[in-house]
Each structure stands twice: as structure tokens, then as C-alpha cells.
């Protein structure tokens, strides 16, 4: 997986009037990292993970840059002619990546009311837009505004590409990004479903990175997809992730089922508790 830095800026308008606040969220390697609030823009680490890793570093530069980007996006929203009454949002997402072979990727995406209407590859300067007429109109609108100050556009977008990569490299160098592996805790619970049946749920939590395989096996053999229900892999607020998989089985058949987990090259299997034991905690095999 490449290292990545992702900026997500959102500005709002109400009845055609652009609001003064904005919201910026920064994700580092897919983890919530910094947040710049519309009330007061102070870049601050998100969650215990970021605070532990980042320590007491001051974020003045990040705060200044994020505030500046917020102002730019507000001006862009003001030039969108499609301002109907009510609440509207303009969102700009910028992503840069450094791959294992040191190659880089940078892109920028604009969303209006949550709908993508314009993207740019910040390395090739190539613009793309969806086919819908609304997206085309919005895209023309925004591109024309950005072209009004050709110099600003040229320097601004080159700088965005360079700055993003520079920041990412700086974070990598300072040890902020630890290519860490945190194994999951896995537990299996059972709950009564209907007469004679129980639902068994296998939960994995506290793992990093987010890629994980979690599935049920009967007599050691993988169950078909349609007999299992999966939860999304979600951040748990500690810089790690959680997910689950469930299936329905006949009561008394618990001993035939195991939950199989694979994460970062490590594997473990976890049995189902029988009878009245509600939770059976299992660690690595």
C-alpha cells in the first residue's frame, strides 16, 4: 500500500450566500489525522493515536495553509452560478501518494452537493468530468473561474501537488507515519435467533492496517458467501479498525464452526462457545 495524504475541504452556502466557516479533514495513510474546525481553525491531531505519535508539535503552518485553502474554496463556491435557495456544499478532495517504488500520484476532485463534477490529475494537469449535463455546467463554471487568474492557477496547482508530497515526506521523515501492524483481538459471540437456531458473530477489533479476511467455516470448510453477513471495516477512533462477520447455525452444532481470520500475513481460527458461555476470547494461534 502506498503512503497517502488526503485533504477534504468543505464549504457551504445558504440561499446563495457563501458561509464564512469551512471544515477541513486530513487523513494520513487512511487514518483521521488533522482537523480544522470552521469555528476556529486550529489544526489538531485526531484521536489518541495521532496525539501519541505526534506529541506536542505545533501546527501553525498547517493551520495557515488549511485556512488559506478554505478561503480559496469559498471564493470558488461564490462563482458557481447554480446557486439555488437552501443549503449547498462545495467539497474539494486532494490526494497525494508515494508508492513503494517512489513513484508519486496526485489528484484533486470537486463535489457539489456531494456529487463529483470535476477531477484533475495534478501531475499531468489533465481534467476529467462526468458526462451529465449538470456536472459539465458546474465544471465549466469552476474551470473558468480558476482560469481567470492563469498565473494563480498555474502556481497554485503546481504548489498543491508539490506541497502535498512535501508534507507527506515530512511526516514520513519525522516518524509520524509508522508502517505498523497491530493484530486484531477476535471474539466470538452467540445470540438466540429463532427456535432451534442461533446467530454466531465473529468480531475483530483494534487492528491495523484495515485489510482483513474474516469468514466462517463449517467442518473446517469455508461457508458460501450467501450464508454469511459482513459488517464494514470501520475506524474505531484509536487509529485502528474493527469489523465483524455473522452466520446463522443450528443450536448444538457450534462445535462444527470456526471463525477464520487473516491479517497482515498472520492467521488464526476461533471456535464458537457452546451453551451458556457468552463470550470466548481467542488470541493468536
Amino acid at each position: 500500500e502506498p503512503h497517502s495524504l488526503r485533504y477534504n475541504l468543505t464549504v457551504l452556502s445558504w440561499d446563495g450566500s457563501v458561509q464564512s466557516g469551512f471544515l477541513t479533514e486530513v487523513h494520513l495513510d487512511g487514518q483521521p489525522f488533522l482537523r480544522c474546525d470552521r469555528q476556529k481553525c486550529r489544526a489538531k491531531p485526531q484521536g489518541q493515536w495521532a496525539e501519541d505519535v505526534l506529541g506536542n508539535k505545533t501546527w501553525d503552518r498547517e493551520t495557515r495553509d488549511l485556512t488559506g485553502n478554505g478561503k480559496d474554496l469559498r471564493m470558488t463556491l461564490a462563482h458557481i452560478k447554480d446557486q439555488k435557495e437552501g443549503l449547498h456544499s462545495l467539497q474539494e478532495i486532494r490526494v497525494c501518494e508515494i508508492h513503494e517504488d517512489n513513484s508519486t500520484r496526485s489528484s484533486q476532485h470537486f463535489y457539489y452537493d456531494g456529487e463529483l463534477f470535476l477531477s484533475q490529475n495534478l501531475e499531468t494537469k489533465e481534467w476529467t468530468m462526468p458526462q451529465s449535463s449538470r456536472a459539465q455546467t458546474l465544471a465549466m463554471n469552476v474551470r473558468n473561474f480558476l482560469k481567470e487568474d492563469a498565473m494563480k492557477t498555474k502556481t497554485h496547482y503546481h504548489a498543491m501537488h508539490a506541497d502535498c508530497l512535501q508534507e507527506l515526506r515530512r511526516y514520513l521523515k519525522s516518524g509520524v507515519v509508522l508502517r505498523r501492524t497491530v493484530p486484531p483481538m477476535v471474539n466470538v459471540t452467540r445470540s438466540e435467533a429463532s427456535e432451534g437456531n442461533i446467530t454466531v458473530t465473529c468480531r475483530a477489533s483494534g487492528f491495523y492496517p484495515w485489510n482483513i479476511t474474516l469468514s466462517w467455516r463449517q467442518d473446517g470448510v469455508s461457508l458460501s458467501h450467501d450464508t454469511q453477513q459482513w459488517g464494514d471495516v470501520l475506524p474505531d477512533g484509536n487509529g485502528t479498525y474493527q469489523t465483524w462477520v455473522a452466520t446463522r447455525i443450528c443450536q448444538g452444532e457450534e462445535q462444527r464452526f470456526t471463525c477464520y481470520m487473516e491479517h497482515s500475513g498472520n492467521h488464526s481460527t476461533h471456535p464458537v462457545p457452546s451453551g451458556k458461555v457468552l463470550v470466548l476470547q481467542s488470541h493468536w494461534q
Epitope: 467442518d219 473446517g220 470448510v221 448444538g252 462444527r256 457452546s274
Partner: antibody, heavy 118, light 107 residues
Framework: QIQLVQSGSELKKPGASVKVSCKAF????????MNWVKQAPGQGLKWMGW????????TYAQGFTGRFVFSLETSVSTAYLQISSLKAEDTAVYFC???????????WGQGTLVTVSS | DIQMTQSPSTLSASVGDRVTITCSAS??????LNWYQQKPGKAPKLLIQ???LLHSGVPSRFSGSGSGTEYTLTISSLQPDDFATYFC?????????FGGGTKVEIK
């Protein structure tokens, strides 16, 4: 520490019966089934079947029906293998092995040698 | 029943040797294969499950691989403690069946 402790060696005459015990330590007995495996002298391993320690339901492999009975005494975390009408070909070491997920024999008893000889 | 055929039945090797034991199934078993080690007069011990997953406490010199009908157990550098008989076991279908065993003896 997980352990399965089996009863001692038995010398029986043809036609007699034998009951081998397997006592589990170190885990919740009713969370895992119990397998029985036969190893005749100088031979490989042959799976005899398993018993669900929660429901008490036995499953016998072909060739181990009729004279072979798996049973339980869950209050003392013990599984039993009973063989009746013993024959010379029943001479073997019998192992109990914890049935993990009904596919894996993850912990084994030390084995019980049953010798059938007149 | 699925027949499991192990080869060789006996293997003579020295400490430090790389040893490979093969297990062939009479039909595809989709990696549903375990390996056990047994020493004379002792119970078998689980080494590897699901073709390649080492059981807890098993040294990393043991590894498993394979697919379809052909599977191998490899000991990268044979140690004195490794002289024993090794069995494969399939769990793709009932009944569970074992290979005939491979005895690894001192050359």
C-alpha cells in the same frame, strides 16, 4: 495447560468388552467435540468418528458402527470409547483427540493400548 | 473415501538436511490439509493446518505448501528433535483420512 489423559492399557479376551476413558483438563469441555482415532501396531492412523460434547450426539465412521460406542460424562469432563465383542483386529492404540472446529485434531491423549488375545 | 498417499514411506537424512515429504490426495482437497508429527510411543502432535499455517509453538523450519491434490511438508534444516513419523490428514470430506505416514530416520 490443555491436556487429555487416557486410562491405562487393557488386555482382553476375544468377545469381551472394554471401556477407554479420556479426561480433559485446561479448557471448557463442552466447547469442543472429541475424536477417537485408532492406530493398529505398525500402522497409520484411522479416524473412528467423533462425539459432540455439548449435545452428546456421536458420529461414527464407516467400519466403526455397531460394536463401538462413544459416550460422555460432562460433569467430570470425560469422554469414553466402549468396544464390545472384541476381536483380534481390535488390538491397537486408541487415541482421543480434541476436535477443533470438526476438522482439526489439535490436542491428543497419550493413547490407550488395547490388546485382544486369547 | 478420499485416499491420502504419502511418499516416501521412509526417508533417511542427516541433521541440517532439507527434507521434503509429499502427500497426494485421490481427488482435489482445496488446501484442506493438516500435518502431524508422531514420535515412537507418543501421541501425534499438530504441526500445520490448512496446508501452510503453523500451529502455535511449532518452529519456523517447518513449512507446508501445495494445492489441488499435491501437498508438501518441508523441514528446512533437520534438527535432532525432528526424527519422527509425519502424517497428513484431509478434511475436505468425511470421513477424515490420514496418509500412511513418512518415517524420517537418521542416516
Amino acid at each position: 495447560q490443555i491436556q487429555l489423559v487416557q486410562s491405562g492399557s487393557e488386555l482382553k479376551k476375544p468377545g469381551a468388552s472394554v471401556k477407554v476413558s479420556c479426561k480433559a483438563f485446561g479448557y471448557t469441555f463442552t466447547n469442543y467435540g472429541m475424536n477417537w482415532v485408532k492406530q493398529a501396531p505398525g500402522q497409520g492412523l484411522k479416524w473412528m468418528g467423533w462425539i459432540n460434547t455439548y449435545t452428546g450426539e456421536p458420529t461414527y465412521a464407516q467400519g466403526f458402527t455397531g460394536r463401538f460406542v462413544f459416550s460422555l460424562e460432562t460433569s467430570v469432563s470425560t469422554a469414553y470409547l466402549q468396544i464390545s465383542s472384541l476381536k483380534a483386529e481390535d488390538t491397537a492404540v486408541y487415541f482421543c483427540a480434541r476436535n477443533y472446529g470438526n476438522y482439526l485434531f489439535d490436542y491428543w491423549g497419550q493413547g490407550t493400548l488395547v490388546t485382544v488375545s486369547s | 473415501d478420499i485416499q491420502m498417499t504419502q511418499s516416501p514411506s521412509t526417508l533417511s537424512a542427516s541433521v541440517g538436511d532439507r527434507v521434503t515429504i509429499t502427500c497426494s490426495a485421490s481427488q482435489g482437497i482445496s488446501n484442506y490439509l493438516n500435518w502431524y508429527q508422531q514420535k515412537p510411543g507418543k501421541a501425534p502432535k499438530l504441526l500445520i493446518q490448512y496446508t501452510s499455517l503453523l500451529h502455535s509453538g511449532v518452529p519456523s523450519r517447518f513449512s507446508g505448501s501445495g494445492s489441488g491434490t499435491e501437498y508438501t511438508l518441508t523441514i528446512s534444516s533437520l534438527q535432532p528433535d525432528d526424527f519422527a513419523t509425519y502424517f497428513c490428514q484431509q478434511y475436505s470430506k468425511f470421513p477424515r483420512t490420514f496418509g500412511g505416514g513418512t518415517k524420517v530416520e537418521i542416516k
